[in-house]
Every structure is written in C-alpha cells, then in structure tokens.
Interface confidence: medium
C-alpha cells in the first residue's frame, strides 16, 4: 500500500519593492504555485490556525510599518521609525482574515519608499484544521 | 478516492496575566479545542519532536524569567531583568516533558507581577513521530 | 478505519563545537534518526520548500559567520564580529542545495574557534512538495 501523501500546506512568499506613504506596500507573488492568494495587496487567509510569519526588508528612508490582519485588531508586527526589518513571529489567523501593510513616512516628501529584499512569508502550522475556499 | 486529511497537529496557545515571585506564571488556555493540555501551570508534552515556541508579554515590573521543560536541563528561554519579552525559538521536546515558567523579581515587594499580552504558543513540527497519551 | 499516519517530516539538528578560520564549522548529527543527512560538513536538501532555521552558539573569540545554501546566492544568515548567535529565520530551499558555514576570525592567530552550545536546526515546512533522494 502506498503511504498517504501530504496535501499541500497553505503557504506563500510575497515580495514588495515599493510602499506608498499613508497606504501600504505593493505586494507580488513571484511564483504561480503558491497555495495562498494575493488580492488587493492583501494575502487572503482561508484556513484557521497558527501561522509562521517572516518579514524582511531594507527601506530607502525611515518609516513606520505595521502588518495587519483584521479591522479593529492590533497589528501582527509594528515597527516605528526603522530603515530595515528582519522579524519572525507566530499568530493565530482565521478564514476571512486579510494580511496587509500600513506604512507612514516621516519625511516631508510624500514620495514612494523603495524597498530592497522586501519579503513576507506566511506558513500555516495547523493543517487538518478548518479551511474554506 | 478522498485524499487523506491531516490528523490535528499538536499545538496550544496559553495566556498568562499574573506571575508569582520565585514561582511561575498562572497559565490558562482560552480555547477548549487545543490539542495539548495544561496541568499544574505546565504544558504537557505528549509527542517527541521539534517545537516552535513563541513567548510574548509586558510585565508590571522588572523581572527575570525562564521557561523550563525538564528538571536538570537548561531553560528554553532565559531573560534577565526585563519588562517585556517577544521571543521565538525552536527546541526538541519529548513525551513526559512539561513546559513551565520560573520567575524572580528584583523588588523587595513580594507582590504578584501583572502581565499584559502574556502569551505562550507551542506548535509541534514533527507530526508522524512518537506520541503517547 | 485507522487515520493515516504522517510520513516523517524532513528535519535535522546538528551540533558544532569547532569552526576553522576561513573555512567552516565541523558539524555532527547527534541522532541516527534524523530524516536529513550531513555530507562534507553540509546539510543536504532533498525537498523543495520553506525551512524553519534555528542557529545558536557561543564562540571562543570574535568572528564573522555566514550560513550559505547555494553558490552565488546571498547567505541565509550573516553575522559580523560576534561572539554569540541566537537567530531564527525562514528560507526557501530546494533539492540539491547544501547548507554550510563560512567563518572568518579577526585575530592574527589562525587557531580553531571553539564553540559552546553550537546548534543548527532545519525543519521543512512544506511536506507534500517535491522531494528527490
């Protein structure tokens, strides 16, 4: 008998090279094989459970950056007046959540912020839990 | 043929709002659906393997905090003279281990330490390994 | 019907007690049960996907340490002029990658660097993806 295969784990890596002041970051998924989707610069959560979250980037100017998942809830990450980020965390997310950025710069110029090495990874840690598509 | 489902992954999120000097932190599991159990302010390990461990909290006063898993072994985390923690780590735990806090304050007052946003998450990383219940 | 068992997750914990200047660290796997292999002081990657990577150690002298996975690619970790490391990260690795250290010391003496508590853990996060052995 063939041993059972794992169904694909919900995971995604998105890249961002540009953020807009008082808005968010323009995220793109470099691979078509991702098991999670991007919509309106947000990562769509279909499965309940813990997620491993990795966030990296170097910014062209000082900014404050938050990563949100649900209106009215605190951010997953919140960094104040930084020029780079290299953080890892764990959070419980659920069906219908959307993971998105909010960015504020402190310069008088309201230009885009360039990002080098900008990467956000989400990996579901509870396969077998509730999912809805 | 229906593809196999994942059996539930061993994981738990516990909260703590109070720690006792020279003792530990009072931990509670907010969800009844957790796949791991709390007993005597310890998280019980049933399955051998690597665990992803996330620890967060803001303390009402400066303290030294350690997270242990086995008598006679070094701590999983050890923080000296801090008022907050936001750490993530990986450790190999085994059946019969118990994850628990030890706390020491540096004040002469032996009051309980209040904790804001106190959260400890454990997620098993090696499903398919040995478990005993 | 018996619920399906998980095939073993690709994971490994290696230890290192010694690093050689302008070379790497001598890594050994303390367990024979690891699902990943060490070859020529490198950890061999057989499965595509995200990996959780934990790196710890205390060094006998100041050094610069990088953890590589593929020629011509940037490092997974890069630490400059440190005497200890306690880092965690996530990276996408693929079949044929090899995870290995590069170390440089700043002393005129070309002695080996001793390492206390040197530990590198890799845990595959995408079971069900492509593997080749």
């Amino acid at each position: 008998q063939v041993p059972p295969q794992y169904p694909p784990i919900q995971s995604i890596r998105v890249q961002f090279t540009r953020c807009e002041n008082e808005k968010g970051c323009i995220i793109t998924s470099p691979s078509k094989d991702e098991t999670m989707k991007v919509q309106d610069n947000s990562i769509i959560i279909n499965c309940d459970g813990f997620y491993l979250i990795s966030l990296k980037g170097y910014f062209s100017e000082e900014l404050s950056l938050s990563l949100y998942y649900r209106k009215g809830r605190g951010p997953l990450f919140s960094l104040s007046k930084v020029t780079s980020v290299d953080s890892i965390g764990v959070a419980y997310l659920a069906f219908k959540d959307k993971v998105y950025f909010n960015v504020t710069t402190h310069s008088t110029s309201y230009k885009d912020i360039q990002v080098n090495g900008g990467e956000l990874i989400l990996i579901h840690q509870n396969p077998g839990g509730f999912c809805a598509y | 043929q229906v593809p196999p489902q994942y059996p539930p992954i061993q994981s738990i999120r516990v909260q703590f709002t109070r720690c006792e000097n020279e003792k530990g932190c009072i931990i509670t599991s907010p969800s009844k659906d957790e796949t791991m159990k709390v007993q005597d302010n310890s998280i019980i390990i049933n399955c051998d393997g690597f665990y992803l461990i996330s620890l967060k909290g803001y303390f009402s006063e400066e303290l030294s905090l350690s997270l242990y898993y086995r008598k006679g072994r070094g701590p999983l985390f050890s923080l000296s003279k801090v008022t907050s923690v936001d750490s993530i780590g990986v450790a190999y735990l085994a059946f019969k281990d118990k994850v628990y806090f030890n706390v020491t304050t540096h004040s002469t007052s032996y009051k309980d330490i209040q904790v804001n946003g106190g959260e400890l998450i454990l997620i098993h990383q090696n499903p398919g390994g040995f478990c005993a219940y | 019907q018996v619920p399906p068992q998980y095939p073993p997750i690709q994971s490994i914990r290696v230890q290192f007690t010694r690093c050689e200047n302008e070379k790497g660290c001598i890594i050994t796997s303390p367990s024979k049960d690891e699902t990943m292999k060490v070859q020529d002081n490198s950890i061999i990657i057989n499965c595509d996907g995200f990996y959780l990577i934990s790196l710890k150690g205390y060094f006998s002298e100041e050094l610069s340490l990088s953890l590589y996975y593929r020629k011509g690619r940037g490092p997974l970790f890069s630490l400059s002029k440190v005497t200890s490391v306690d880092s965690i990260g996530v990276a996408y690795l693929a079949f044929k990658d090899k995870v290995y250290f590069n170390v440089t010391t700043h002393s005129t003496s070309y002695k080996d660097i001793q390492v206390n508590g040197g530990e590198l853990i890799l845990i595959h996060q995408n079971p069900g993806g492509f593997c080749a052995y």
């Epitope: 090279t17 170097y58 062209s60 110029s109 230009k111 360039q114 090495g117 | - | 940037g74 490092p75």
Partner: antibody
Framework: EVQLVESGGDLVRPGGSLRLSCVAS????????MSWVRQAPGKGLQWVAF????????TFADVVRGRFTISRDYAKNALYLQMNSLRAEDTAVYYC???????????WGQGTLVTVSS | SFVLTQLPSVSVTLRQTARITCGGD??????VYWYQQRLGQAPVLIIY???NRPTGIPERFSGASSGNTATLTISGALAEDEADYYC??????????FGGGTHLTVL
C-alpha cells in the same frame, strides 16, 4: 576619514572573467549598503549592481544580470564584483559607492579601470 | 525602463545662476539625487531626495522636482563649480538610473 579603495582592474579578453575588490575604512561597513557604478571612457555614469547592508538583497542592471555577481565580506570590510563573460562594452572605470540610506551614494572610491579587448 | 534626459552642456557667467534640468516621465513622483564630478575625480553627492544638501555642500546648490522635470540650481556659480552634473533616481524595480550628464562651463 572615510575611504573606499578599489582594485582588480585589468586588461582582459572578451569572454574572460575578472574580480574587482573594494576595501572600506573609516565607517561602520556593516551598516552601509554598497553599489558598483561604472563610467565608460568619455561617457556618463552607469549603475551596475547593489547589495544591501545585510547581504541578503542584491539587484543588477539589465545589461549585466546573469553575468555579474556582487558580494561582501564583513570580516574584511570588503565588497566584490565578480564579472564573467566580459564584453567590449564593459570597458569602464568601476567605482564602488556606499550609502547608509541606500538611495544615496554617500561615499565613492577613486575607481579601477577594466579594459575588455582582444 | 525609466529614462532621464539631460542637456549635454550648459554655460553660465561667473556669479550668475545656473539651472541644470533632468527630464523623466513623472519624475516629480520620485526622489531625485544629484552628483557633481570634476574632471579626473570621483562623483560627489550634492543633493539628495530632491532638495536636501549633505553636510559640507555649499548653500548655493539647491534642488527642486515636480511633474516631468527636476532642476539643480547653482545660485552664484563659481569657477570651481565647472564640472559634470548627473541626476539619478531609483525605478520601481530598484534599479538606479542616471541621466546622461550635463557639463557646466563657468565663463
């Protein structure tokens, strides 16, 4: 005093390889993003490659992508440009430049000349 | 990719105002940087993020940017200002783009 000193420039045949080095002093190398910028004889500046302070992010001009790699050695305070499959049009003075905010090239070296000719 | 257009040369009478322009599609939405390169020397950053001067750069140098044009202004040009001037931006793919350069002659 901040100093960037390039070396490794030489005469090389088309299709050949060369490795340029840039040694930094007078500032905290770890905190600075680094670039290579070139200038063909009698021509303007052309950016070539960038590596961020942590070494994890690199970008390249389209004309050198796949042929050139950029790397850094924190122990030696050194930046490198490995140039393969060289062409006549790669002939230029190559400058290394650094910036604490990576959009500025705050400091520049004096350059090293690379000549690609048969 | 993003193209920056500069006039090859500009002349100015000693102690008069020189203006060097840099054209590019909606360049006003990007941060613009200016470099001075004297003959036989390495470039020097003189303006960053449109209109900011690094420490040590004289006040006579200023910058502005809007629409499709960025401008470097030298108020009261001196003989030592004779040099090549390059504008630079980063495009949305994080590639640095330089203009072709403008040679300033001080008469």
């Amino acid at each position: 005093e901040v100093q960037l000193v390039e070396s490794g420039g030489d005469l090389v045949r088309p299709g050949g390889s060369l490795r340029l080095s840039c040694v930094a002093s007078g500032f905290t190398f770890n905190n600075y993003h680094m670039s290579w910028v070139r200038q063909a004889p009698g021509k303007g500046l052309q950016w070539v490659a960038f590596i961020n302070s942590g070494g994890s992010g690199t970008t390249f001009a389209d004309v050198v992508r796949g042929r050139f790699t950029i790397s850094r050695d924190y122990a030696k305070n050194a930046l490198y440009l490995q140039m393969n499959s060289l062409r006549a049009e790669d002939t230029a003075v190559y400058y290394c430049a650094s910036g604490s905010i990576w959009t500025h090239f705050d400091y520049w070296g004096q350059g090293t000349l690379v000549t690609v000719s048969s | 990719s993003f193209v920056l257009t500069q006039l090859p040369s500009v002349s100015v009478t000693l102690r008069q105002t020189a203006r060097i322009t840099c054209g590019g599609d909606i360049i006003g939405s990007k941060n613009v940087y200016w470099y001075q390169q004297r003959l036989g020397q390495a470039p020097v950053l003189i303006i960053y993020r449109d209109n900011n001067r690094p420490t040590g750069i004289p006040e006579r140098f200023s910058g502005a940017s809007s629409g499709n044009t960025a401008t470097l202004t030298i108020s009261g040009a001196l003989a030592e200002d004779e040099a090549d001037y390059y504008c630079q931006v980063w495009d949305n793919s994080n590639k640095a783009m330089f203009g072709g350069g403008t040679h300033l002659t001080v008469l």
